[in-house]
């Protein structure tokens, strides 16, 4: 799996999970979230050569097409596969509110 | 939806469905498929600017992060959303065999 266990341990030009820390205030302009101040969102990036973690038959077809037609612009792309939620704490007036924001953290990647 | 109805009618630099005809023999080196000789596989390509058909909260975070940090390499990517199967005819000796290959045709796209 193209997850932290594999990608953070190997220098990998191909599609892999990359570390990315998001600071809510600085990076998104959100001042209202009390905790956390930011989080490890991560992101997916890298080349998708023939059969590198292909997600569907179509992405396999594309990567094969690309191998035979290297000048073509049609190629698979490295995107998130498994995502996890993030729990945040904010205030409605003086009242604390805990909420779970779905699909905020990327755990693994795929070529799609 | 970033599908043929929208994308093939509009000149769109942003993430959209693009036409791509795959000739099995020429483009994939597959000589064994009897019918069809090729098919409209299509593919997804184009920029994923802020809020352009974002797929998940994470892709929204990335596009927002990218707006505030335009030099960043972390950005969403245009990939397939809805896929359809393709029915093919091939021969096992003299015996015709009809098979459905899943997820071969891209019908719409998303920023993920």
């Amino acid at each position: 799996a193209l997850d932290a266990a594999y990608c953070f341990r190997n220098v990998q030009d191909n599609c892999c999970l990359r570390p990315l820390y998001i600071d809510f205030k600085r990076d998104l302009g959100w001042k209202w979230i009390h905790e956390p101040k930011g989080y490890n969102a991560n992101f997916c990036a890298g080349a998708c050569p023939y059969l590198w973690s292909s997600d569907t038959q179509h992405s396999r077809v594309l990567s094969l097409y690309n191998t035979i037609n290297p000048e073509a612009s049609a190629s698979p792309c490295c995107v998130s596969q498994d995502l996890e939620p993030l729990t945040i704490l904010y205030y409605i007036g003086k009242t604390p509110k805990i909420e779970q924001l779905s699909n905020m953290i990327v755990k693994s990647c795929k070529c799609s | 939806a970033l599908d043929a109805a929208y994308c093939f009618r509009n000149v769109q630099d942003n993430c959209c469905l693009r036409p791509l005809y795959i000739d099995f023999k020429r483009d994939l080196g597959w000589k064994w498929i009897h019918e069809p000789k090729g098919y409209n596989a299509n593919f997804c390509a184009g920029a994923c600017p802020y809020l352009w058909s974002s797929d998940t909260q994470h892709s929204r975070v990335l596009s927002l992060y990218n707006t505030i940090n335009p030099e960043a390499s972390a950005s969403p990517c245009c990939v397939s959303q809805d896929l359809e199967p393709l029915t093919i005819l091939y021969y096992i000796g003299k015996t015709p065999k009809i098979e459905q290959l899943s997820n071969m045709i891209v019908k719409s796209c998303k920023c993920s």
């Epitope: 959100w30 205030y91 007036g93 009242t95 | 802020y50 809020l51 909260q57 927002l64």
Partner: antibody, heavy 121, light 111 residues
């Protein structure tokens, strides 16, 4: 510049529903809470609730709970407020207003022009 | 809910007058070292306009003749020298407690 443009006036019968829209421009729509405030003719201001467009998180005034739904369409930077089971005392001007961004519940720095909703049989 | 009581409900004044409007909250709106009290101006047929936020901070573009003060439960909006364009209704608003609530308004009329 920041602008909030609301949909036009509506006349509704008691028991019906109304959906008011508010199209935002000139700022990052998903980064600010959007509030809805109403004002009955000749009366003061009454806060109805708010929505965070990024996640769809909402916080409604209990007085309207069960009758109001706030939604957003991030692709068009538009906020919506739907009020159901309308009564004659729901006749008011309805405003969308952007929170200034320091807190979820906050002061409001930009307001729409208002939408008059008249409930009459 | 926090009740907001404004006084007076209306007042008549002349151009150049110093005008003071008060707002009393039914409980303290102070926490985290801030007073969660704001002031708006509304003219007939128009949307409210933010003047002062967090009790004493002047909103960008608002003339300096407007000022706000107070803490806890008692707050004041002052117009140091009333101008013709200042004749309007003024509202206070708290966001220390859910739901957010407004005062009943103070109408400033020409004497």
């Amino acid at each position: 510049q920041v602008q909030l443009v609301q949909s036009g006036a509506e006349v509704k019968k008691p028991g019906a529903s109304v959906k008011v829209s508010c199209k935002a421009s000139g700022y990052t729509f998903t980064s600010y809470w959007m509030n809805w405030v109403r004002q009955a003719p000749g009366q003061g201001l009454e806060w109805m609730g708010q929505i965070f467009p990024f996640s769809g998180s909402t916080n409604y005034n209990e007085m309207f709970e069960g009758r109001v739904t706030m939604t957003t369409d991030t692709s068009t930077s538009t906020a919506y407020m739907e009020l159901r089971s309308l009564r004659s005392d729901d006749t008011a001007v309805y405003y969308c207003a952007r929170g200034i961004g320091n807190y979820a519940l906050d002061a409001m720095d930009y307001w729409g022009q208002g939408t008059l909703v008249t409930v009459s049989s | 809910d926090i009740q907001m009581t404004q006084s007076p409900s209306s007042l008549s004044a002349s151009v150049g007058d110093r005008v003071t409007i008060t707002c009393r909250a039914s409980e303290s709106v102070d926490f985290w070292g801030n007073s969660f009290m704001h002031w708006y101006q509304q003219k007939p047929g128009k949307a409210p306009k933010l003047l002062i936020y967090l009790a004493s901070n002047l909103e960008s573009g608002v003339p300096s003749r407007f000022s706000g003060s107070g803490s806890g439960t008692d707050f004041t909006l002052t117009i140091s020298s009333l101008q013709p364009e200042d004749f309007a209704t003024y509202y206070c608003q708290q966001n220390a407690e859910d739901p957010l609530t407004f005062g009943g308004g103070t109408k400033v009329e020409i004497k």
